[in-house]
């Protein structure tokens, strides 16, 4: 038996209510309101991890402030995890890093001259200045130290909630410092740091702070060089004036570590390499190093994004007199996000934000029920993740639909085939004082003992108004309940399968006709609730023509209101 009715409905079924567990992030500083804007970079190359940047996904922080859309900074955040840059060599002082939670537009600049011969590590250390060059307001959840005028960040952290615990050697008291470990020559690096304090009348005070950075200088042959960066942003510049032997080239490493939950974005400001020189970029911090780019892709303006909170850049140059070439890259941290949740088949998903704290809400098309969480929250982590698996929309095997006003019931698997050995019961209950009209969108049962019964009542013993075993054809006009219930049964045997059924229902008031429906068309009605005397005129969408039934129907018979003709169907021309 394979019978198909001419129309398909589009009503809304009442959903299965589920409670949403809301996750709340820790309070964070206010974030300026802003709209969505795209940043694209030139040239545009269709490469792995080279995307236009959607810096804000939707307007976070609008109206309510949306604290939950911002990543929370723990009061004692863990330092970024140690590097495991296999196969690249492990560097010193990577076990303890200052932490931050938000990128800022601070810029790292060119090296400066050493200012002091004194430092905490060795008498021979050279200490370039790390100067603050621009005032910057803290971003959301930004761990920025607030220093008063004249204060200097020292190796002993001030007692503030944001201060990370020092677990290893290094300048943990100097937040956001680009640390330089130069084996071969002293390299000065100027970075930036800002602090801002607000007085009672909300005036902003900008403070310039001088921070001493120590550089270890050792002479080593053949002259590898490496730098570690742990700030939210900085500059990666090709080494110059290295006092390395003249007969070897350079093999330099730039390691960048940002706060977990952020990725590293590297922008090529300038690059001019000589033939044979290589620059490679890898994402670290995952199970395996992730190759991101090499010199062939590193064109000016290109942006490389590591989806992990650690990255490494390796520069291998030629020996003099040919080399080395030059480059100037700028890196900054960017907030990692959850992947866009998969839209369920026969459903949809609405996302407020893909960043930690953002949420995704799922709902199903009429006739389908959600299996799984209706509401997911993006959680902050080294790689942010949704707090539950994406749900799926399933055509449930039965159920109770109370206050059924308009909607659909479909067999499990629809529009795919149903399973064997099913017995599904649906109870439809119209609102008090109303009856139900049931329309057959599709009924396709296997030729064996599969069976669909629709009963005029609320139980398995109520007399049927449709039984696929006994009825010769599907009624185009559908079925009417005498009361407020329909009881639908689908049973399948152990062999054979077909698409099953899709039934559309609508409730209507006593003394009225049910609301008409025509797929691929429209209708106009003389009155909105279809009492006796109402006339309805049908029309079809472009490319379709009216067939069977009548263009105009009327609700007749005050004792038992019904349409005087069947609804027409719109067929493709």
């Amino acid at each position: 038996l394979s019978l198909e009715a001419p129309t398909v409905g589009k009503g809304q079924a009442p959903g299965i209510e589920e409670t949403d567990g809301e996750l709340t992030a820790a309070p964070t500083p206010e974030q300026p309101e802003r709209g969505v804007h795209f940043v694209t970079t030139a040239p545009t190359l269709k490469l792995l991890n080279h995307h236009p940047l959607l810096e804000e996904f939707l307007q976070e922080g609008l109206e309510k402030g949306d604290e939950e859309l911002r990543p929370a900074l723990p009061f004692q955040p863990d330092p970024p995890a140690p590097f495991t840059p296999s196969p690249l060599p492990r560097l010193a002082n990577q076990d303890s890093r200052p932490v931050f939670t938000s990128p800022t537009p601070a810029m790292a600049a060119v090296p400066t001259q050493p200012q002091s011969k004194e430092g905490p590590w060795s008498p021979e250390s050279e200490s370039p200045m790390l100067r603050i060059t621009a005032p910057l307001p803290p971003g959301p959840s930004m761990a920025v130290p607030t220093l008063g005028p004249g204060e200097i960040a020292s190796t002993t952290p001030p007692s503030r909630a944001w201060t990370p615990t020092q677990e290893g050697p290094g300048d943990m008291g100097r937040p956001w410092v680009a640390e330089v470990v130069s084996q071969g020559a002293g390299i000065g690096i100027q970075g930036t740091i800002t602090s801002s304090t607000a007085s009672g009348d909300d005036e902003e005070t900008t403070t310039t702070t001088t921070i001493i950075t120590t550089t270890i200088t050792t002479v080593q042959t053949p002259g590898p060089c490496s730098w570690n960066f742990s700030g939210p942003e900085g500059s990666l510049d090709s080494p110059t004036d290295l006092s390395s032997p003249t007969d070897v080239g350079l093999d330099c490493f730039f390691y960048i570590s940002v706060y977990p939950g952020y990725g590293v974005e590297i922008k090529v400001q300038n690059i001019s390499l000589r033939e044979g020189e290589t620059v490679t970029v890898e994402g670290l911090g995952g199970p395996d190093p992730l190759p991101l780019a090499n010199q062939s892709f590193l064109l000016r303006g290109q942006v490389i994004r590591s989806p992990t909170h650690q990255a490494a850049l390796r520069f291998q140059s030629l020996p003099p007199p040919a080399g080395p070439g030059t480059f100037h890259f700028h890196y900054q941290a960017y907030l990692l996000s959850c992947h866009f949740p998969r839209r369920p088949a026969y459903g949809d998903v609405t996302v407020t934000s893909l960043h930690p704290g953002g949420s995704a809400r799922f709902h199903c098309a009429t006739g389908y029920q959600l299996k799984g969480a209706r509401h997911l929250t993006c959680l902050n982590a080294t790689q942010p993740f949704w707090d539950s698996k994406e749900p799926v929309c399933i055509a449930a095997c039965g159920g109770v639909i109370r206050n059924a006003t308009t909607g659909r019931i479909v067999s499990p698997g629809f529009p795919g085939n149903y399973s064997n050995n099913l017995t599904c019961h649906w109870l439809l209950e119209a609102p008090e004082g109303q009856r139900l009209h049931l329309h057959f969108e599709k009924v396709s049962l296997a030729e064996d003992d599969d069976r669909l019964i629709i009963r005029n009542g609320d139980n398995v013993e109520a007399p049927p108004v449709y039984d696929s075993y006994e009825v010769e054809y599907l009624p185009i006009e559908g079925l009417l309940s005498s009361g407020k219930h329909f009881f639908v049964e689908l049973s399948t045997d152990s062999s054979g399968a077909a698409a099953g059924m899709a039934l559309r229902y609508e409730a209507f008031q006593q003394g009225h006709c049910y609301e008409p429906f025509v797929k691929y068309g429209n209708f106009s009605s003389s009155t909105p609730t279809y009492p006796v005397g109402t006339t309805v005129e049908f029309s079809c969408d472009p490319g379709y023509t009216l067939e069977q039934g009548s263009i105009i129907i009327e609700c007749v018979d005050p004792h038992d209101p019904q349409w005087n003709e069947t609804e027409p169907a719109c067929r493709a021309v």
């Epitope: 005029n456 049927p464 039984d467 075993y469 006994e470």
Partner: nanobody, 124 residues
Amino acid sequence: DVQLVESGGGSVQAGGSLRVSCAVSGYTKSSGWMGWFRQAPGKEREGVAAIGRRSGDRYYVDSVKGRFTISLDSTKNTLYLQMNDLKPEDTGTYYCAAGGRAGNVLTSQPYRYWGQGTQVTVSS
């Protein structure tokens, strides 16, 4: 041509029993509904019982549940209604019907073919 012919009606005392029959000819379908209806003088016709030719499922109006039994002998192509514990309100003309349309099986909707009826009288 489908024909339905009822027989077995008559008069009976309240509490008595009666069996009415309906011989079906020309109806070759293995599926569809067969039903019994009755009409008392001055009243509308009402469904009494129905049976599915393929499923054998049986349905009864509430007023006769436990007293009447519908059955179908497919070999003889005959429909029966066994009536026990008859009451005066069971009096009326009993009609046999057959059909395979959708609709409440205890209403006339599904039925296309009808017999002429047989009279049943229950006196107190």
